[in-house]
């Protein structure tokens, strides 16, 4: 059974990785730039099913593409720095799904824009950090 | 104990620029994110961003952007917001809060001319 | 953004009292609600988090309750040193936003 040390780590990182996303969201909906109408063609995939830690797994297979995408971000009004940003958003993903998961992720049938793709894990996070608190 | 400690009150006129800090004690400085929070006088309270004390990257409110930048100096676990432009609009109380259980105790920005 | 509504924006009340503020917002934001108790000259001092939770240190006179768009603050005898201004706050999205505020003043 999880300690309460263990599930205030749990919480904790999740809260970091809820910031971070949330962070994203913010950053693209203030973007006032022709760059993101490009940056809603490009196209996520969405987990089938994302209510546990092991379901991570489907965010950190997109962590790549969502890179890329912020890379066309890049401005002085954009202020994530998304290599650091992404790193940050692994290391936490790897903590909490755990590394010796061997969970192949199921993906839904339809894919997302990267604002439908943020908000699906935001809400994935303040899910289970409800569950904790 | 859990304190952050800000830099002293300023006065500045329209068009400068202010440089307010936050020093944090008694915790892990890159545990929690550190938000800043402004308050005009009789008014109430307006986020106006938020920046990672281990990578230090930011995110603002619309409304600043462009204006504010926040930084941090891991060796001094001190985090730094500065404003640029200034007006008399923006004449505050400006605070940090991380984890928004633990503020500073706030510093004072008075812009006039 | 999501904007958060406070009522009523003052009370005047004694010592003893219930005192119950709401604070509703514009779009569902779950538990995702704080509430802060603010002193002239003083930072905010976080009361509730999490819609209901009770921060640590904070006396068991103030509660917490709501989710979706409607919330309220309840303080079931109001004490000398409760009179302050108190402010709601929404975590759910970025921005973070704050309800305007209620004074709670000595009738």
């Known amino acids: 059974a999880p300690t309460s040390s263990s599930t205030k780590k749990t919480q904790l990182q999740l809260e970091h990785l809820l910031l971070d996303l949330q962070m994203i969201l913010n950053g693209i909906n203030n973007y006032k730039n022709p760059k993101l109408t490009r940056m809603l063609t490009f196209k996520f995939y969405m987990p089938k099913k994302a209510t546990e830690l092991k379901h991570l797994q489907c965010l950190e297979e997109e962590l790549k593409p969502l890179e890329e995408v912020l890379n066309l971000a890049q401005s002085k009004n954009f202020h994530l720095r998304p290599r650091d940003l992404i790193s940050n958003i692994n290391v936490i993903v790897l903590e909490l799904k755990g590394s010796e998961t061997t969970f192949m992720c199921e993906y839904a049938d339809e894919t997302a824009t990267i604002v439908e793709f943020l908000n699906r894990w935001i809400t994935f996070c303040q899910s289970i950090i409800s569950t904790l608190t | 104990q859990v304190q952050l400690v800000q830099s002293g009150a300023e006065v500045k006129k329209p068009g400068a620029s202010v440089k307010v800090s936050c020093k944090a004690s008694g915790y892990t400085f890159t545990r929690y994110y550190m938000h800043w929070v402004r308050q005009a006088p009789g008014q109430g309270l307006e986020w106006m961003g938020i920046i990672n004390p281990r990578a230090g990257y930011t995110s603002y409110a619309l409304k600043f952007q462009g204006r504010v930048t926040m930084t941090r100096d891991t060796s001094t676990s001190t985090v730094y917001m500065e404003l640029s432009s200034l007006r008399s609009e923006d004449t505050a109380v400006y605070y940090c809060?991380?984890?928004?259980?633990?503020w500073g105790q706030g510093t004072l920005v008075t812009v006039s001319s | 953004d999501i904007q958060m509504t406070q009522s009523p924006s003052s009370l005047s009340a004694s010592v003893g009292d219930r005192v119950t503020i709401t604070c509703r917002a514009s779009q569902s934001i779950s538990t995702w609600l704080a509430w802060y108790q603010q002193k002239p000259g003083k930072a905010p001092k976080l009361l509730i988090y999490a819609a209901s939770s009770l921060d640590s240190g904070v006396p068991s006179r103030f509660s917490g309750s709501g989710s979706g768009t409607d919330f309220t603050l309840t303080i079931s005898s109001l004490q000398p040193e409760d009179f302050a201004t108190y402010y709601c706050q929404q975590s759910y999205s970025f921005p973070v936003t704050f309800g305007q505020g209620t004074k709670v003043e000595i009738k």
């Open positions: 809060t991380s984890g928004w259980d633990v």
